[in-house]
Interface confidence: medium
């Protein structure tokens, strides 16, 4: 049995994450009327390297057979939405590309790729840019998120 919970994530500037097209997440500020456009994640607690401050999770989109995954594209670690077989996912032993180390710092969360250590789910300061995998090496990109629970 894999344990999951449903949640929404916002970046440190309170930008929400929305699905753009079929396979891309973007971060933007939403007003009250269109807050329902935010994606709801199904966060599953999976096997991986565990410590008290790093918890392995997989991030699926609720109601869709899509999971965030980390792959090498053009010699660079890249975040993508990957379609999966709904009869087999989520599972405890998720392939490493689907696994993120959830790191809690006070009330903020970071999501480090298990496949590519020190690369994090990131958003740009700029509105309506894709969510991506960044290595936060001195740049302006945002890697901290807040989590809001959603009733299952």
């Amino acid at each position: 049995a894999v344990r999951s919970l449903h949640c929404r994530l916002q970046d440190a500037q309170q930008k929400s994450l929305v699905l753009s097209g079929t396979y891309e997440l973007k971060a933007l500020h939403l007003n009250a009327e269109n807050l329902n456009q935010q994606v709801v994640f199904s966060m599953s607690f999976v096997q991986g390297e565990e410590s008290n401050d790093k918890i392995p999770v997989a991030l699926g989109l609720r109601g869709k057979n899509l999971y965030l995954s980390c792959v090498m594209k053009d010699d660079k670690p890249t975040l993508q939405l990957e379609s999966v077989d709904p009869n087999r996912y989520p599972k405890k032993k998720m392939e490493k590309r689907f696994v993120f180390n959830k790191i809690e710092i006070k009330d903020k969360l970071e999501f480090e790729s298990a496949q590519f250590p020190n690369w994090y789910i990131s958003t740009s300061q700029t509105e309506y840019m894709p969510v991506f995998l960044g290595n936060n090496s001195g740049g302006q990109d945002l890697i901290d998120f807040s989590m809001e629970f959603v009733s299952s």
């Epitope: 919970l5 009330d107 959603v150």
Partner: antibody, heavy 120, light 107 residues
């Protein structure tokens, strides 16, 4: 530090109900599962069920469905377990516990226990 | 339900002795296993979760291991304060189930 403080001992008549509370401090209440466990006199431990206060997700042991009702109040950081239609075999110490390190990593902290005695 | 068969049910050991308690799971529990210590009239105290991770403040003489579906708790050098009842717990599948307990007494 993390603390779980439970309500005091109760003596109830058969057929009555009782509501045990578990007040949590020292961590973000909404984020971690609260477990309920019972221990009959001289016996081992038995898992009743759990709740994730942040969204009200509840999982019960089938054996306790209809007997135990688990709730949580995030405004007071308190979890509750109500036991209904009490019988003498419900006499036990009831514990709350929390999976503090995260959702699947083990019961880490425990309340002091609440003794519920069912006696005519 | 997953059955956790714990052995021995009781044992005597001498101070300084190495002590091992085992739990056998009736099916695969993916290493989702904790160990607890309980003293008379007290709440259980969590020693280990996820087979071998020690809870903060638990002495390093306690350790956990697994071999297939057999899980072990070892106390490397028994101390007087270690006497009590020890329980294992699987929390892989609902309903979570505890072992029957091992009463450890000082010889």
């Amino acid at each position: 530090q993390v603390q779980l403080v439970q309500s005091g001992a109760e003596v109830k008549k058969p057929g009555a109900s009782v509501k045990v509370s578990c007040k949590v401090s020292g961590y973000t209440f909404s984020r971690y599962w609260i477990e309920w466990v019972r221990q009959a006199p001289g016996k081992g431990l038995e898992w009743i069920g759990e709740i994730l206060p942040g969204n009200g997700n509840i999982n019960y042991n089938e054996k306790f469905k209809g007997k135990a009702t688990i709730t949580a109040d995030t405004s007071t950081d308190t979890a509750y377990m109500e036991l209904s239609s009490l019988r003498s075999e419900d006499t036990a110490v009831y514990y709350c516990s929390t999976i503090y390190y995260d959702y699947d990593q083990g019961f880490t902290y425990w309340g002091q226990g609440t003794l519920v005695t069912v006696s005519a | 339900d997953i059955k956790m068969t714990q052995s021995p049910s009781s044992m005597y050991a001498s101070l300084g002795e190495r002590v091992t308690i085992t739990c056998k799971a009736s099916q695969d529990i993916d290493r989702y296993l904790s160990w607890f210590q309980q003293k008379p009239g007290k709440s259980p105290k969590t020693l280990i979760y996820r087979v071998k991770r020690l809870v903060d403040g638990v002495p390093s003489r306690f350790s956990g291991s697994a071999s297939g579906q057999d899980y072990s708790l070892t106390i490397s050098s028994l101390q007087y304060e270690d006497m009590g009842i020890y329980y294992c717990l699987q929390y892989d599948e609902f309903p979570y189930t505890f072992g029957g307990g091992t009463k450890l007494e000082i010889k």
